[in-house]
Interface confidence: low
């Protein structure tokens, strides 16, 4: 009799997930000399140990602690860029501005970016058919708990001026239910972080509104201020020009507002 397999609402584990994690680890450690000491097989063993044989709705931050330990990495605390619902532009930015870092520029973020994974209780099988959906099934699933764990640690590490890129095209520019809104905002350390500077990215070319006056941005400002952290906000009206000016700051057109 075939063993009954739980059908979840979300997509299954990414094809070739173990191979991808291992390959990404090797690539990352080759590119980043400061992480050359990392043993990628041990990293994979710790990653797998966090969710294999465990019920995919019963994962805890503790399950990921061995992986967190192996992935310990020093990122300049005053060069952290958070983002919400605008990952691609944030990554394009740090690819140009090499001294700034998103979570996905760290080893652990890089390993898991865009991947889905889950296991099954009491077997070491990876479930390639389906994984729990955060809303429809459970929030304590392997992927959600991973990102909550690494995001919390990333925010806790930040200091001085922390930047966050927000998507001005969305109805909720700041969303309290996003990872940024539910985890990172609340784990910035007031004794270390002086200012949170939001960059609101405009979508339309003719959009000249001041999105820093958006009610959700005001809500963010209120949350941050209550935590004794200063808040500032900038409109990025032309993200394409913004990136161009990061690449070539001497360009004469870069003195005007972007």
């Amino acid at each position: 009799v075939p063993r009954w397999r739980q059908q979840w609402s979300g997509p299954g584990t990414t094809k070739r997930f173990p191979e991808t994690v291992l390959a990404r680890c090797v690539k990352y450690t080759e590119i980043h000399p400061e992480m050359r000491h990392v043993d990628c097989q041990s990293v994979w063993d710790a990653f797998k140990g966090a969710f294999i044989s465990k019920h995919p709705c019963n994962i805890t931050e503790e399950d990921y602690q061995p992986l967190m330990k192996l992935g310990t990495q020093t990122v300049p605390c005053n060069k952290i860029l958070l983002w919400s619902r605008i990952k691609d532009l944030a990554h394009q930015f740090t690819q140009v501005q090499r001294d700034m870092f998103t979570l996905e520029d760290t080893l652990l973020g890089y390993l898991a970016d865009d991947l889905t994974w889950c296991g099954e209780f009491n077997t070491s099988k990876i479930n390639y058919q389906s994984c729990p959906d955060w809303r429809k099934d459970c929030s304590n699933n392997p992927v959600s708990v991973f990102w909550k764990t690494v995001s919390r640690r990333f925010a806790e590490a930040a200091c001085d001026v922390v930047h966050v890129m927000l998507n001005g095209s969305r109805s909720k520019i700041f969303d309290k239910n996003s990872t940024f809104g539910s985890v990172e905002v609340h784990n910035l350390q007031p004794e270390k972080v002086q200012t949170l500077e939001a960059w609101v990215i405009h979508g339309g070319r003719e959009d000249s509104r001041d999105l820093c006056q958006d009610p959700t941005i005001k809500e963010l400002e209120s949350i941050i201020s209550k935590r004794n952290i200063q808040f500032s906000c900038k409109n990025i009206y032309r993200p394409d020009k913004f990136l161009q000016c990061v690449k070539n700051p001497e360009d004469s057109s870069c003195t005007s507002e972007i």
Epitope: R3, K15, R16, P18, E19, L22, Q41, W44, D45, K48, I52, S53, F121, N122, T123, S124, K125, Y128
Partner: antibody
Framework: QVQLKESGPGLLLSSETLSLTCTVS????????VSWVRQLPGRGLEWMGR???????DYNSDLKSRLSISRDIAKSQVFLKMSNLKTEDTGTYYC?????????????WGPGTMVTVSS | QFTLTQPKSVSGSLRSTITIPCERS????????VTWYQQHLGRPPLNVIY?????PSEVSDRFSGSIDSSSNSASLTITNLQMDDEADYFC??????????FGGGTKVTVL
């Protein structure tokens, strides 16, 4: 060091049940999967089934109706039972340890045990 | 479930290079890693390549593995062929249920 060793009767009659034991050392059955693989005379290798670290089992669909795999963690032993033997089940039976987890290959094999089924 | 097809035999002269192909019948060869085993007569198989092209540290660097998506095949290449390389070679992969699939095996003869 890692070792696996198969044991069991070498000669059986058709329709009897084969019982083999794989005794392992140097690793734990709660950390590594162990599979049974057989090799029939003049033929290739055939995967029979495995026991997972959690205790669950998987079987080759062609053999499923006749196979049963179990284990005793305390004794570091994995067991294979195959019922309703036929003369064409004659061959060498190996147990093997899964390598890593992600590659599904075997890094350590037992020396094998020869099983002859006569009519 | 797919099958893995190997030639029955491959031969090469001493110190030459031979390649053993292993063709996957359906699905992409890159979907799942391929492993290669060497088996001498009366001995259990020995893992010589895992994860398509990775070689265990104790295996000679004369052995290399590769995959070719155009022919949907994996290959084991042995350079500087030695008498001791005379053995049977099996490719192996796994399907989406992690059931293990072996190729039929290739007998390598050193001339």
């Amino acid at each position: 060091q890692v070792q696996l060793k198969e044991s069991g009767p070498g000669l059986l009659l058709s329709s009897e049940t084969l019982s083999l034991t794989c005794t392992v050392s140097g690793f734990s059955l709660t950390s590594y999967e162990v599979s049974w693989v057989r090799q029939l005379p003049g033929r290739g290798l055939e995967w029979m089934g495995r026991v997972w670290i959690g205790g669950d089992t998987d079987y080759n669909s062609d053999l499923k109706s006749r196979l049963s795999i179990s284990r005793d963690i305390a004794k570091s032993q994995v067991f294979l039972k195959m019922s309703n033997l036929k003369t064409e089940d004659t061959g060498t039976y190996y147990c093997a340890r899964a390598y890593g987890f992600n590659y599904w290959s075997f890094d350590f094999w037992g020396p094998g045990t020869m099983v002859t089924v006569s009519s | 479930q797919f099958t893995l097809t190997q030639p029955k035999s491959v031969s090469g002269s001493l110190r030459s290079t031979i390649t053993i192909p292993c063709e996957r019948s359906s699905g992409d060869i890159g979907d799942n890693y391929v492993t290669w085993y060497q088996q001498h007569l009366g001995r259990p198989p020995l893992n010589v390549i895992y994860a398509d092209d990775q070689r265990p540290s104790e295996v000679s660097d004369r052995f290399s593995g590769s995959i070719d998506s155009s022919s949907n095949s994996a290959s084991l290449t042995i350079t500087n062929l030695q008498m001791d390389d005379e053995a049977d070679y099996f490719c192996q992969s796994y399907d989406s249920n992690t059931d293990i699939i072996f190729g039929g095996g290739t007998k390598v003869t050193v001339l």
